[in-house]
Interface confidence: low
């Protein structure tokens, strides 16, 4: 991944094709790295990231990571290759058009991550019950 402020020139080595001959263009994703966030106790949040980036590689998808500890809440937005772990986790939902947050076990903090494969899909991160039904107890905590 390339941070937006050091974007490389867009050139023909980014144009690749899949097995069916379809051109795979790199995605457009929000790319603000880690920033403080006010997103808390909400069904969904906007990233408030003003930087959209063309991902460096056509296979990369959009990722958002929401973290809360005793001191602050942060939201990370990046491009990342789903074949590689991110924060030691596999991007299981990389093919999803929406960024639906799922909790991951991290000691000392609440850690949610989502990935998605439509343009700028990590601008809207979703915690809502209609999507995330895998942990009802957690939802009660979020929405109380």
């Amino acid at each position: 991944t390339i941070p937006p402020h050091v974007q490389k020139s867009v050139n023909n080595d980014m144009i690749v094709t899949d097995n069916n001959g379809a051109v795979k263009f790199p995605q457009l994703c929000k790319f603000c790295d880690v920033r403080f966030s006010t997103c808390d106790n909400q069904k969904s949040c906007m990233s408030n990231c003003s930087i959209t980036s063309i991902c460096e590689k056509p296979q990369e998808v959009c990722v958002a990571v929401w973290r809360k500890n005793d001191e602050n809440i942060t939201l990370e937005t990046v491009c990342h290759d789903p074949k590689l772990p991110y924060h030691d986790f596999i991007l299981e939902d990389a093919a999803s058009p929406k960024c639906i947050m799922k909790e991951k076990k991290k000691p000392g903090e609440t850690f949610f991550m989502c990935s998605c494969s439509s343009d700028e899909c990590n601008d809207n991160i979703i915690f809502s019950e209609e999507y995330n039904t895998s942990n009802p107890d957690l939802l009660l905590v979020i929405f109380q």
């Epitope: 051109v23 263009f25 457009l28 700028e120």
Partner: nanobody, 120 residues
Framework: EVQLLESGGGLVQPGGSLRLSCAAS????????MYWVRQAPGKGLEWVSA????????YYADSVKGRFTISRDNSKNTLYLQMNSLRAEDTAVYYC?????????????WGQGTLVTVSS
């Protein structure tokens, strides 16, 4: 079926201007990021510019930054590329494209393209 029809190319002197258009059909235009790419004689494809579905985000190759402007009119399903201060090295066939656009095997990429020739 996705169809993209480029137009507006021609012969122009160095320092001149052209405006390319791309009429799109067969998909929900306003939901798709769109791209201009070009192929100079005897060379490979090169990215020129990209624009998000809403038109709010635009991107340019370093070689055209400050000279070219990409835009779109979603009500007309049309993509544009305004090219100013043209140089000889901008000579190429220009194609518009969307993500997942299929290559027509044994034919040009994304339709006929439009030829831009910059020469004195």
């Amino acid at each position: 079926e996705v169809q993209l029809l480029e137009s507006g190319g021609g012969l122009v002197q160095p320092g001149g201007s052209l405006r390319l258009s791309c009429a799109a059909s067969g998909f929900t235009f306003g939901q798709e990021s769109m791209y201009w790419v070009r192929q100079a004689p005897g060379k490979g494809l090169e990215w020129v510019s990209a624009i998000s579905g809403s038109g709010g985000s635009t991107y340019y190759a370093d070689s055209v930054k400050g000279r070219f402007t990409i835009s779109r009119d979603n009500s007309k399903n049309t993509l544009y590329l305004q090219m100013n201060s043209l140089r000889a090295e901008d000579t190429a066939v220009y194609y518009c494209a969307k993500s997942g656009t299929r290559i027509k095997q044994g034919f040009d990429y994304w339709g006929q393209g439009t030829l831009v020739t910059v020469s004195s």
